[in-house]
C-alpha cells in the first residue's frame, strides 16, 4: 500500500507542494489522515497528519468545546493507494481578515498562542490580546494548554493560549480518537504565562490553612517545614486530564457540541502505524486566522462547526 505522508503543525507541512508518498510496511492496509482544528476568539489553526495507518476504513468527525475554545477533529482511513488526501486541511479564509476591532474589550487580557510553535509560546513571549464577549458568552478567563494529535505513528502537539469562559478550570480537557485539547484556566491580567503546574482548587472547598503552632511549641521552623511539605505534595503532572467533580456546578463543563458523529465502519486510531518512510513538515511560521467573522470550517469534508463570534 502506498500512502501520502505529511505532518502539519499549524504551518504548511501538508500544503500543496509538501506532499510525500510512502510505501507502507507489511500488514498495513489503511492510509490515514487526521486533522484537528482549534479555534479561539482570536484565531484558529490546525494540526494534521497523513500516513500509513492501522485499523479499518471509515470516517469520524467530531466537534468539541472546552470553555469556549472550539476543537474540531476529523479522521479518515481508506484502503486504496494514495487515498488519504480527501480532507481539506486549509481553514476557511477570512473576508476581510482580522476585524476583531469591532468587538468591545471586556477588560481581561491574556497571552495568545494560535498556531505558534512551542519555542514562540514560552512565558511572556507570545502576543497579548484583549478578551471580548462573543455571541452572549463571556470570555474573562485565560487558558494555557496543548492540542495533541496522534495518527500514523506520529504525534503532533502545539501549545494553545487565549481567552476562555472559565477562570478556574484545572487540567481540563476534551478528547476525540487520537486527539486531545487540554489545559488550565486562570483569572487576572496575563495570568496564563505557565499553568502547567496548576493544582485543582474548588471554590466550594476551603483551602488548607496552616494554623500557627501553639506558643509553647517549637520555633517557627516547624511550621515552615510543614508548609513546604504541603506545597510539594501538590500534584504537578500535566499528562493526565482531570475533570473537576466537586465544583462542577459552578464551572462551565466541557462538552461535545451538538454535532453528528459520522462513524463509517468505526474508524479509529488505536494501534498506531507500521509504515516506514519519513514524514514531511517542519515547525516554523504558523498559519492562523482570526475567527471574528468566520462562518464554518473546514471548507470541505465532514461535519462543520459554526463559529461563535460575529457570524
Amino acid at each position: 500500500l502506498e500512502c501520502y505522508s505529511c505532518v502539519q503543525k499549524a504551518d504548511d507541512g501538508c500544503s500543496p507542494h509538501r506532499m510525500k508518498t510512502v510505501k507502507c510496511g507489511p500488514g498495513v492496509d489503511v492510509c490515514t489522515e487526521a486533522v484537528g482544528a482549534v479555534e479561539t476568539i482570536h484565531g484558529q489553526f490546525s494540526v494534521a497528519v497523513r500516513g500509513c495507518g492501522s485499523g479499518i476504513p471509515g470516517k469520524n468527525d467530531r466537534g468539541l468545546d472546552l470553555h469556549g475554545l472550539l476543537a474540531f477533529f476529523q479522521l479518515q482511513q481508506c484502503s486504496e493507494d494514495r487515498c488519504n488526501a480527501k480532507l481539506n486541511l486549509t481553514l476557511r479564509g477570512l473576508n476581510p481578515a482580522g476585524n476583531e476591532s469591532a468587538y468591545e474589550p471586556n477588560g481581561a487580557e491574556c497571552y495568545s498562542c494560535v498556531g505558534l510553535s512551542r519555542e514562540k509560546c514560552q512565558g511572556s513571549m507570545p502576543p497579548v490580546v484583549n478578551c471580548y464577549n462573543a455571541s452572549g458568552r463571556v470570555y474573562k478567563g485565560c487558558f494555557d494548554g496543548n492540542v495533541t494529535l496522534t495518527a500514523a505513528n506520529v504525534t503532533v502537539s502545539l501549545p494553545v493560549r487565549g481567552c476562555v469562559q472559565d477562570e478556574t478550570c484545572t487540567r481540563d480537557g476534551v478528547t476525540g480518537p487520537g486527539f486531545t485539547l487540554s489545559g488550565s484556566c486562570c483569572q487576572g491580567p496575563r495570568c496564563n504565562a505557565d499553568l502547567r503546574n496548576k493544582t485543582y482548587f474548588s471554590p466550594r472547598i476551603p483551602p488548607l490553612v496552616l494554623l500557627p503552632p501553639p506558643t509553647t511549641a517549637a520555633p517557627s521552623t516547624r511550621a515552615q517545614n510543614s508548609s513546604s511539605t504541603t506545597s510539594t505534595a501538590a500534584p504537578t503532572t500535566t499528562t493526565s486530564i482531570i475533570k473537576p467533580t466537586t465544583a462542577q456546578a459552578s464551572h462551565t463543563s466541557p462538552h461535545e457540541m451538538d454535532l453528528e458523529v459520522i462513524q463509517e465502519e468505526g474508524a479509529s486510531l488505536s494501534g498506531g502505524a507500521a509504515g516506514h518512510g519519513g514524514t514531511a513538515g517542519h515547525g516554523g511560521a504558523a498559519g492562523h486566522q482570526d475567527r471574528s467573522n468566520m462562518e464554518k470550517y473546514p471548507g470541505k469534508g465532514g461535519a462543520q462547526i459554526p463559529a461563535k463570534g460575529g457570524s
Epitope: 500544503s15 507542494h17 509538501r18 506532499m19 510525500k20 481578515a97 514531511a280 516554523g284 511560521a285 471548507g299
Partner: antibody, heavy 117, light 112 residues
Amino acid sequence: EVQLLESGGGLVQPGGSLRLSCAASGFTFSNAWMSWVRQAPGKGLEWVSYISSSGSTIYYADSVKGRFTISRDNSKNTLYLQMNSLRAEDTAVYYCAREGLWAFDYWGQGTLVTVTS
Amino acid sequence: QSVLTQPPSASGTPGQRVTISCTGSSSNIGAGYVVHWYQQLPGTAPKLLIYDNNKRPSGVPDRFSGSKSGTSASLAISGLRSEDEADYYCAAWDDRLKGPVFGGGTKLTVLG
C-alpha cells in the same frame, strides 16, 4: 473561471523598487496558497516566493531573500510582491500561480520586469 | 544550474513516443516528494500537465503520462503531435531549499 492577472512590471534601474500585483478571481482566494514564479528571457522557470492562505507562512528563494516581500490582501483577492534592491539578474517575466492538487494549477499571463541602467 | 536535471532538448516525429527524464536528489524526489510536469507553449504561461507523479488534470489528453522511481521521474508523450512542440518542466519540493524547485526545462521539437 479561474483568472490571475499580474500588473506592476516595467523598466527600473539597478537598486530600484517595484511592486507587483496579482488580481485573482473565479475561486476562493482566501483558501489558496499562492506563489510567484519568474522566468528570465530565454531561460527556465524559477520559484521566487510562497505564501499561505492566511498570509502567516512565507518562504523565499535564496536569490531574493531579504530583498523581496510577498504579501496578500484576502479582502481584495490580491497577491503582492514588493521588490527592492533590484539587480540585473532579476530581469524576468513574473508569474503569479495558485497552488492546488500539490502543484501550480493556474498561472497568470505574467508581467515583465526589466532591470537595466 | 537547476536542482532537477532535464535534458535540454528532445525530438520525435508525429505519432512517435517520446520520454523526458527528470533527475533529482535525496532532498527532493528521493525524499518522496511528488513530481509535477508543466508544459509551456511558445509565448504563453506554463500549464499544469501532470501532478502527483502520474495524475492528469481534466482536459489533458491521456497521451501524456508520468512516472517516478527513486530519485528520478519521467514524462512520456505517445502519439506525438505538432501541437506538443513546447518546453516541458518538472518540479518538486526540496527540503534543503524549503521551496518548490524546477528542472531546467526540455525543449521538445516535433520533426517533419
